[in-house]
Amino acid sequence: MAVTACQGLGFVVSLIGIAGIIAATCMDQWSTQDLYNNPVTAVFNYQGLWRSCVRESSGFTECRGYFTLLGLPAMLQAVRALMIVGIVLGAIGLLVSIFALKCIRIGSMEDSAKANMTLTSGIMFIVSGLCAIAGVSVFANMLVTNFWMSTANMYTGMGGMVQTVQTRYTFGAALFVGWVAGGLTLIGGVMMCIACRGLAPEETNYKAVSYHASGHSVAYKPGGFKASTGFGSNTKNKKIYDGGARTEDEVQSYPSKHDYV
């Protein structure tokens, strides 16, 4: 039951996270005009990954797309790439995880296959979340650098009569959406990986032999590792009730897929 809950919750958290990554990528407010000492402004500038916008206090808003590809800063291109990779990986991860969900039955799919799919989607979610966090962080770093450069040149032409105020940009809402969404996708991915451990059937990767010592009916069995996932060890040391030595295969009853709740 706990495994199903963990897997389901991981899926839902990742779904919310990826929706957030998509939303952040599409949002226009990655950077917004810094309203230093001036909360009311007649012209408010904000920029996204795909277009820049100007909102005039009278109500008119105009957005212009970045119609050039080569003329854009390399950092912006890198952020775009990271966010798109994050979305693509997340989308594939969601698709894989739907089929991996324990509550969904698809033909006679083995639990080992579901475990592998859960692990795959979990890893994809983790990478997707990391891509989003990296993309947003790169953009934020770019903003901080530009902010202090703008501050250093806050006013140009101070020697003359004309004063030109340079527009400074600060963190926009999309950055926070991106960070949170990336974090959620990452957490969801970790939960899927944890759920994978409980999903995998407990198989051994070699035949363990039980020896029957005279006068004792205690079986010795070395701990075998799960063949499919490589996590954990087999701790079910079974007693052998008849005489001679046998292979574990002859006495161990493997769990069926219906034994898991």
Epitope: V40, V43, Y46, S58, F60, T164
Partner: antibody, heavy 118, light 113 residues
């Protein structure tokens, strides 16, 4: 086409409060515009007093800020100006105007002359 | 506050001749976000409210004759009437809409010589 019409007393005594109303027709006061008050003393230039925008936010000229209040009544499709503690220097033609693209005043009322005199 | 200074204060031009009015701002009116200058030009005839002619320094308002044109960027702007008509006799004002409080120039009176 948006039309604006100012109304209010033409004579106000010094130290009293000047109250004017602008009635908007041909458009909603809640639509994406800003609704401004501008004044022009006789024979002189134009002075922006302040505005209330589509979201109900206000902005005022700092030179008048302590005395000015601009509000709106969406049910009547009107916005109003209150200017307290008036003096003879506040005698002017008061215009209401709509600003939109470029924060420019695209529609104007005909204006109403307010004289401050005892 | 941004101070707007118009020149000349008055201008007498013959019918059909070009009239040029200048406007200078104490601060740049160019917005880096959209590369637009937040300057407007108005025409006011006696006993009437002002009428918008030009916004964003060079965009003509709909219904305004094409003999009116605006130019300039940053702090220096010009309104040009390419061929003055009798109905163009009026006072012309420039207005900055880039930062609060919005301010107007003192006006330029255009007359027929």
């Amino acid at each position: 086409q948006v039309q604006l019409q100012e109304s209010g007393p033409g004579l106000v005594k010094p130290s009293e409060t000047l109250s004017l109303t602008c009635t908007v027709s041909g458009g909603s006061i809640s639509s994406n515009y800003a609704w401004n008050w501008i004044r022009q003393p006789p024979g002189k230039g134009l002075e922006w007093i302040g505005y209330i925008n589509y979201s109900g936010n206000t902005a005022y000229n700092p030179s008048l800020k302590s005395r000015v209040t601009i509000s709106r009544d969406t049910s009547k499709n009107q916005f109003s100006l209150k200017l307290s503690s008036v003096t003879a220097a506040d005698t002017a033609v008061y215009y209401c105007a709509t600003s939109y693209y470029g924060n420019s005043f695209i529609y104007w009322g005909q204006g109403t002359l307010v004289t401050v005199s005892s | 506050d941004i101070v707007m200074t118009q020149s000349p204060d008055s201008l007498a031009v013959s019918l059909g001749e070009r009239a040029t009015i200048n406007c200078k701002s104490s601060q740049s009116l160019l917005n880096s976000g959209n590369q637009k200058n937040y300057l407007a030009w108005y025409q006011q005839k006696p006993g009437q409210p002002p009428k918008l002619l030009i916004y964003w320094a060079s965009t003509r308002e709909s219904g305004v004759p094409d003999r009116f044109s605006g130019s300039g960027s940053g702090t220096d702007f010009t309104l040009t009437i390419s061929s003055l008509q009798a109905e163009d006799v009026a006072v012309y004002y420039c207005q900055q809409a880039y930062s609060f409080p919005w301010t107007f120039g003192q006006g330029t009176k255009v007359e027929i010589k």
